[in-house]
């Protein structure tokens, strides 16, 4: 016997209070698949988050981060402060890369310069806080 709720499309829920008819999701909620018995609360992009895509009756809102921050985690679950190139984020804020390390992005950690001698090469261009060394023949 087919479940009558399976006929309820995305954007609705199967309403047990109304003999299992398909009722529209309330405002600020959605159902992305058919046959749901409740709708889901829309994600709200507040504070450091900003709305990249509005919630609709069939899909959740999508957030990104305000300028000066970048997304971390699945679906941008967190926003992390940007640093400048040549820096990394620590518990005490943005700190310059130590000598011998670099970071060419606004996120992530400082990484050691390439050791050219491991490949039998020499340093063609010295490294900086923002750039790795360039190895030559």
């Amino acid at each position: 016997l087919q479940d009558p709720c399976s006929n309820c499309p995305a954007g609705t829920f199967c309403d047990n209070n109304r003999n299992q008819i398909c009722s529209p999701c309330p405002p600020n909620s959605f159902s992305s698949a058919g046959g749901q018995r409740t709708c889901d609360i829309c994600r709200q992009c507040k504070g450091v988050f900003r709305t990249r895509k509005e919630c609709s009756s069939t899909s959740n809102a999508e957030c990104d981060c305000t300028p000066g921050f970048h997304c971390l985690g699945a679906g941008c679950s967190m926003c992390e402060q940007d640093c400048k190139q040549g820096q990394e984020l620590t518990k005490k804020g943005c700190k310059d890369c130590c000598f011998g390390t670099f970071n060419d992005q606004k996120r992530g950690i400082c990484r050691p310069w390439t050791n050219c001698s491991l490949d039998g090469k020499s340093v063609l261009v010295n490294g900086t806080k923002e750039r790795d060394v360039v190895c030559g023949p």
Epitope: N17, P26, P27, T38, C39
Partner: nanobody, 122 residues
Framework: EVQLLESGGGLVQPGGSLRLSCAAS????????VGWVRQAPGKGLEWVSA????????YYAESVKGRFTISRDNAKNTLYLQMSSLRAEDTAVYYC???????????????RGQGTQVTVSS
Amino acid sequence: EVQLLESGGGLVQPGGSLRLSCAASGFTVSAEDVGWVRQAPGKGLEWVSAILDSGGSTYYAESVKGRFTISRDNAKNTLYLQMSSLRAEDTAVYYCARIVYHAGGGVTFDTRGQGTQVTVSS
């Protein structure tokens, strides 16, 4: 027990106005997310308007924006829908609704009343 009693419907000419009322009991209108849904002849339910986030924001369907205004009287525990510039396509049974948030994170709504019929016709 939650009860919702709608009133204020009737027959009105296109361009006219009506004010629907919903007297609530069994819960406090000012502390909940509440609104109006409607069902036009031969069609499914449609959300019209709602007061959300304990009054922090309001929702209006695109089809009624600028014409309908939702409000509430906390002292009377009553929800209102002021409808103006009415059109034939606004003809429907209007139900007061209480949005229900379930422990598992789901959202549904309750309509306990019989609704009030609004007919827009010349």
